[in-house]
């Protein structure tokens, strides 16, 4: 049985202020059962960027259809990037439970924000 891998292929992404950033994440298995969530930063101060339960997250859209079955692409797009969005973004798989528990994290993608071209 294949062990879940979380692949964040881009170590870093640079985006001009005001543009959109695409953060890629794919998984290799549907197991364990449980949701994917995106965070900026690590540890107790990390910030939730997207999940299906909370929100709304008006600046975040999923790259794949949220209704797609057996989907393994959990990439997101963040619109209207500002310098406050800079940081490392982690795609994290949670194991279903009461409460859900963190199972595995991707390696992270560092987002840097360039000045808006004049």
């Amino acid at each position: 049985e294949e062990e879940l891998q979380i692949i964040q292929p881009d170590k870093s992404v640079s985006v001009a202020a005001g543009e959109s950033a695409i953060l890629h994440c794919t998984i290799t298995s549907l197991f364990p059962v449980g949701p994917i969530q995106w965070f900026r930063g690590a540890g107790p101060a990390r910030v939730l960027i997207y999940n299906q339960r909370q929100g709304p997250f008006p600046r975040v859209t999923t790259v794949s259809e949220t209704t797609k079955r057996e989907n393994m692409d959990f990439s997101i797009s963040i619109s209207n990037i500002t310098p406050a969005d800079a940081g490392t973004y982690y795609c994290i798989k949670f194991r279903k439970g009461s409460p859900d528990t963190e199972f595995k994290s991707g390696a992270g993608t560092e987002l840097s924000v360039r000045a808006k071209p004049s």
Epitope: L30, V33, E65, K68, R69, E70
Partner: antibody, heavy 120, light 108 residues
Framework: DVQLVESGGGVVQPGGSLRLSCAAS????????MTWVRQAPGEGLEWVST??????YYADSVKGRFTISRDNSKNTLYLQMNSLRAEDTAVYYC???????????????WGLGTRVTVSS | EIVLTQSPATLSVSPGERATFSCRAS??????LAWYQQRPGQAPRLLIY???IRETGIPERFSGSGSGTEFTLTITSLQSEDFAVYYC??????????FGGGTKVEIK
């Protein structure tokens, strides 16, 4: 074609045990969560248990009495039912889970069911 | 636990007519709702998932709508094989997965 065939039902006395099996074919069994749903006579559908790879989930009504398991080498799902009660009398259906991207699971294929009767 | 309430419990419709019935959730389930059909003596069959997406092979006369707490299944021009019991199921918050009590569609 996806096929799910349940077996192992029967008549058992209260306090007794039964082991249900569900033989799966037509899909990559090991890649999908699987579920048991039951239906008491003349009643609606009640979720019983779901298994992922090794992760298992149970309805409160069966927790501690029923155990779900799977053998991926045999493409078979099991439900071990102990300490059976009259209220466990039902048709037990095996179902294949389908996962929606960012959400949860629904059941896209069902077996025909196997009848369990708990009676003295 | 999310409770799903289906209404009406029984719907009497003539063949060729339209049938509409509802499923109300006790809390917001977004679009995480499926509909199943169960004919007498048969296993349930998936009709709709994500509140509105028809499963492959399901006729176009079946349609789902709604989001949040109010959902509707509509069958236009009922055929003889459509007389059955219909169940909704939420998968927004589980365990447990929960089903509605069902709506029986019978011949008028």
């Amino acid at each position: 074609d996806v096929q799910l065939v349940e077996s192992g039902g029967g008549v058992v006395q209260p306090g007794g045990s039964l082991r249900l099996s569900c033989a799966a074919s037509g899909f990559s069994f090991s890649n999908f969560a699987m579920t048991w749903v039951r239906q008491a006579p003349g009643e609606g559908l009640e979720w019983v248990s779901t298994i992922g790879s090794g992760d298992t989930y149970y309805a409160d009504s069966v927790k501690g009495r029923f155990t779900i398991s799977r053998d991926n080498s045999k493409n078979t799902l099991y439900l071990q039912m102990n300490s059976l009660r009259a209220e466990d009398t039902a048709v037990y259906y095996c179902a294949k889970d389908s996962t929606v991207s960012w959400s949860g699971d629904f059941f896209d294929y069902w077996g025909l069911g196997t009848r369990v009767t708990v009676s003295s | 636990e999310i409770v799903l309430t289906q209404s009406p419990a029984t719907l009497s419709v003539s063949p060729g007519e339209r049938a509409t019935f509802s499923c109300r959730a006790s809390q917001n389930v977004k679009n995480d709702l499926a509909w199943y059909q169960q004919r007498p003596g048969q296993a349930p069959r998936l009709l709709i998932y994500a509140a509105r997406i028809r499963e492959t092979g399901i006729p176009e006369r079946f349609s789902g709508s709604g989001s949040g707490t109010e959902f509707t299944l509509t069958i236009t021009s009922l055929q003889s094989e459509d007389f059955a019991v219909y169940y909704c199921q939420q998968y927004y918050d589980w365990p447990p997965f929960t089903f509605g009590g069902g709506t029986k569609v019978e011949i008028k």
